[in-house]
Interface confidence: medium
């Protein structure tokens, strides 16, 4: 899923889910002056970034598991 780096929303596409084993960390960006949407940006173990759909139940479980592991940025 593509990520842009302007002062606006970063995610142009989102994935409904991704294998937890591929994720190194997750950054949950709350809505604010940069973007009026919650954005979930996963950094993968291969160094790439992927945007995940914050409304997806699978993504919510992933966030919960990673937060519990304490490996968020």
């Amino acid at each position: 899923a593509s990520v842009v780096t302007e002062l606006r929303c970063q995610c142009l596409q989102t994935l409904q889910g991704i294998h937890l084993k591929n994720i190194q960390s997750v950054n949950v960006r709350s809505p604010g002056p940069h973007c009026a949407q919650t954005e979930v940006i996963a950094t993968l173990k291969n160094g790439k970034k992927a945007c995940l759909n914050p409304a997806s139940p699978m993504v919510q479980k992933i966030i919960e598991k990673i937060l519990n592991k304490g490996s968020t940025n």
Partner: antibody
Framework: QVQLKESGPVLVAPSQSLSITCSVS????????VHWVRQPPGQGLEWLGV???????NYNSALMSRLSISKDNSKSQVFLKMNSLQTDDTAMYYC??????????WGQGTLVTVSA | NIVMTQSPKSMSMSVGERVTLSCKAS??????VSWYQQKPEQSPKLMIY???NRNTGVPDRFTGSGSATDFTLTISSVQAEDLADYYC?????????FGAGTKLELK
């Protein structure tokens, strides 16, 4: 249950200013943002601006010079102030909450009429 | 500013028919499009967010789809209570903008 209620209705003379209060309950304005949107009679929706949990704001650039949004977290109230009103500012003014996405819940709106 | 263009401006349908409303963005807005229903003398109500996510309590006959610049709201079998104006809106960049709306009327 999230509820929003705008003060009003309001009659404003041309060139005068407008103040509306949005009272929120069921969620915290210290956690989520609150947007203001207006709708002229028989027309579509126009976004005015938003105040975020931390107090920062974004405005519609077309109206920014006339607009101010502020809040009082202790009273769970959000304020819209607009000056130099003209007849084409006559509209229904709504406040709406931010959640993960904007405009999740809306107030019932308040009619602002600009007339001499 | 991103311009959201809705079509048609109005449509007249019979109960049970399938309805497709279109919304086009003037530039790529990803999936940051929502759909709102506004009944006469009422506030707008969020129906679909993130292009395809149905809001809580919205009947499953309402489906949102699309990404980038082309978005669709489909009502699989229109009911009398669906008579309303429907607006799309983008939240990808400021200022947030809405389409001019589609009025859904019943025959």
């Amino acid at each position: 249950q999230v509820q929003l209620k705008e003060s009003g209705p309001v009659l404003v003379a041309p060139s005068q200013s407008l103040s509306i209060t949005c009272s929120v309950s069921g969620f915290s304005s210290t956690t989520y943002g609150v947007h203001w949107v207006r709708q002229p009679p028989g027309q579509g929706l126009e976004w005015l601006g938003v105040i975020w949990a931390g107090g920062s704001t974004n405005y519609n650039s077309a109206l920014m010079s006339r607009l101010s949004i502020s809040k009082d977290n202790s009273k769970s109230q959000v304020f819209l102030k607009m000056n130099s009103l003209q007849t084409d500012d006559t509209a229904m003014y709504y406040c709406a909450t931010q959640y993960h996405y904007p405009f999740a819940y809306w107030g019932q709106g308040t009619l602002v009429t600009v007339s001499a | 500013n991103i311009v959201m263009t809705q079509s048609p401006k109005s449509m007249s349908m019979s109960v049970g028919e399938r309805v497709t409303l279109s919304c086009k963005a003037s530039e790529n807005v990803g999936i940051y499009v929502s759909w709102y229903q506004q009944k006469p003398e009422q506030s707008p109500k969020l129906m679909i967010y993130g292009a395809s996510n149905r809001n809580t309590g919205v009947p499953d006959r309402f489906t949102g789809s699309g990404s980038a610049t082309d978005f669709t709201l489909t009502i699989s079998s229109v009911q009398a209570e669906d008579l309303a104006d429907y607006y799309c809106g983008q939240s990808y960049s400021y200022p947030l903008t809405f389409g001019a709306g589609t009025k859904l009327e019943l025959k």
